[in-house]
Amino acid sequence: GLECDGKVNICCKKQFFVSFKDIGWNDWIIAPSGYHANYCEGECPSHIAGTSGSSLSFHSTVINHYRMRGHSPFANLKSCCVPTKLRPMSMLYYDDGQNIIKKDIQNMIVEECGCS
Amino acid sequence: GLECDGKVNICCKKQFFVSFKDIGWNDWIIAPSGYHANYCEGECPSHIAGTSGSSLSFHSTVINHYRMRGHSPFANLKSCCVPTKLRPMSMLYYDDGQNIIKKDIQNMIVEECGCS
């Protein structure tokens, strides 16, 4: 998956740091104090639609087959720059009962971006 | 996640059957002959951006915090109707060496759609 470098406007991964204090979560998230969540941005021209980061998922490959053949309704589907690979991260926080929990939270960090 | 019922144009899951014969894959996929891949379509107005089916992923919850506050650069990010939950499926196929393989292939079936 492409890293955004300011030179291209094609779908890429942009670095972004989330501060839990900024969003008011620091009173229940013990650690970390923030993290690099990242996000996806950029254009998805038709020739790269269905390219999910470095590798295609089976589903997007199949749908792209139909899309590239102008098969209705896929020809008109908007292709979007979205996370295609997310990574978990370990967090220490208070749960709803104020117990301290250490848990690997799924889908916290965007690793790769691609065109849906 | 919403199922498309023809009544709403909000992001929803559309039923779609893929025939491997149609896309010319029947010469290497032994079974099944096709499957319900489904796909996502529909609008993502700002008030539902970041709502991934029935529950938010941690990443989209965080980004939505910033987006809904009009925080640059998220305010201008295009929100898209994309798969938020995919399911694997078992397939029987020939590999490159013409060996018969039975494998659970990840991300084959769209289970839920949501706004990125």
Epitope: G24, N26, D27, M91, D96 | H47, M68, R69
Partner: antibody
Framework: QVQLVQSGAEVKKPGASVKVSCKAS????????MHWVRQAPGQGLEWMGS????????IYAQKFQGRVTMTRDTSISTAYMELSRLRSDDTAVYYC????????????????WGQGTLVTVSS | EIVLTQSPGTLSLSPGERATLSCRAS???????LAWYQQKPGQAPRLLIY???SRATGIPDRFSGSGSGTDFTLTISRLEPEDFAVYYC?????????FGGGTKVEIK
């Protein structure tokens, strides 16, 4: 300690509007969503909707769509629920309740509630 | 939406007895995002159980929650005089958030 203090009882005529406030203290106001739940006399609990105080993002129950407006003033840690076009069957106790709606972390129960505001709709 | 059905509507028991309250969901409540609340007359509801089985802060251990999927249970092992109240289950996995109709535990 966490406290949610609601405004006092109201008596309204049919067709009028009511605005109930919920002042939060003892925690970071914008870090938790605020939900509104009502309870008609002798009846069960009915969820009306919620607001994310950080972003202002709201989700309303379909039943109240178009009649309810949830807002907040982060400078005074207060959430508001306004219900318009009141009918007699809107007579109920209205509660605010806080929650962290983060399913990925297993969070979302209503851990603190306001004391309730009785709204009576009568001609 | 997920519809929650509580049974029985009323439970008449004596102090010291065991109370078993049921909550059934119209569809699976994924990852046990289910809570139980206690409400006494003239008071706001109070969180008892979250995540189907975890006790909230300050809740005595005579209260326990169990279940997954579509069937959930709140058990009060030995009823104390202060436990006579109405109990509600609630799901928080999807919008709209929904509550069960409640079970009233009254003194026999």
């Amino acid at each position: 300690q966490v406290q949610l203090v609601q405004s006092g009882a109201e008596v309204k005529k049919p067709g009028a509007s009511v605005k109930v406030s919920c002042k939060a203290s003892g925690y970071t106001f914008h870090g938790y969503n605020m939900h509104w739940v009502r309870q008609a006399p002798g009846q069960g609990l009915e969820w009306m909707g919620s607001i994310n105080p950080y972003s202002g993002y709201t989700i309303y129950a379909q039943k109240f769509q178009g009649r309810v407006t949830m807002t907040r003033d982060t400078s005074i840690s207060t959430a508001y629920m306004e219900l318009s076009r009141l009918r007699s069957d809107d007579t109920a106790v209205y509660y605010c309740a806080r929650a962290r709606d983060i399913a990925a972390a297993g969070l979302g129960a209503f851990d603190y509630w306001g004391q309730g505001t009785l709204v009576t709709v009568s001609s | 939406e997920i519809v929650l059905t509580q049974s029985p509507g009323t439970l008449s028991l004596s102090p010291g007895e065991r109370a078993t309250l049921s909550c059934r969901a119209s569809q699976s409540v994924r990852s046990s995002y289910l809570a139980w609340y206690q409400q006494k007359p003239g008071q706001a509801p109070r969180l008892l159980i979250y995540g189907a089985s975890s006790r909230a802060t300050g809740i005595p251990d005579r209260f326990s929650g169990s279940g997954s999927g579509t069937d959930f249970t709140l058990t009060i092992s030995r009823l104390e005089p202060e436990d006579f109240a109405v109990y509600y289950c609630q799901q928080y996995v999807s919008y709209p958030r929904t509550f069960g109709g409640g079970t009233k535990v009254e003194i026999k």
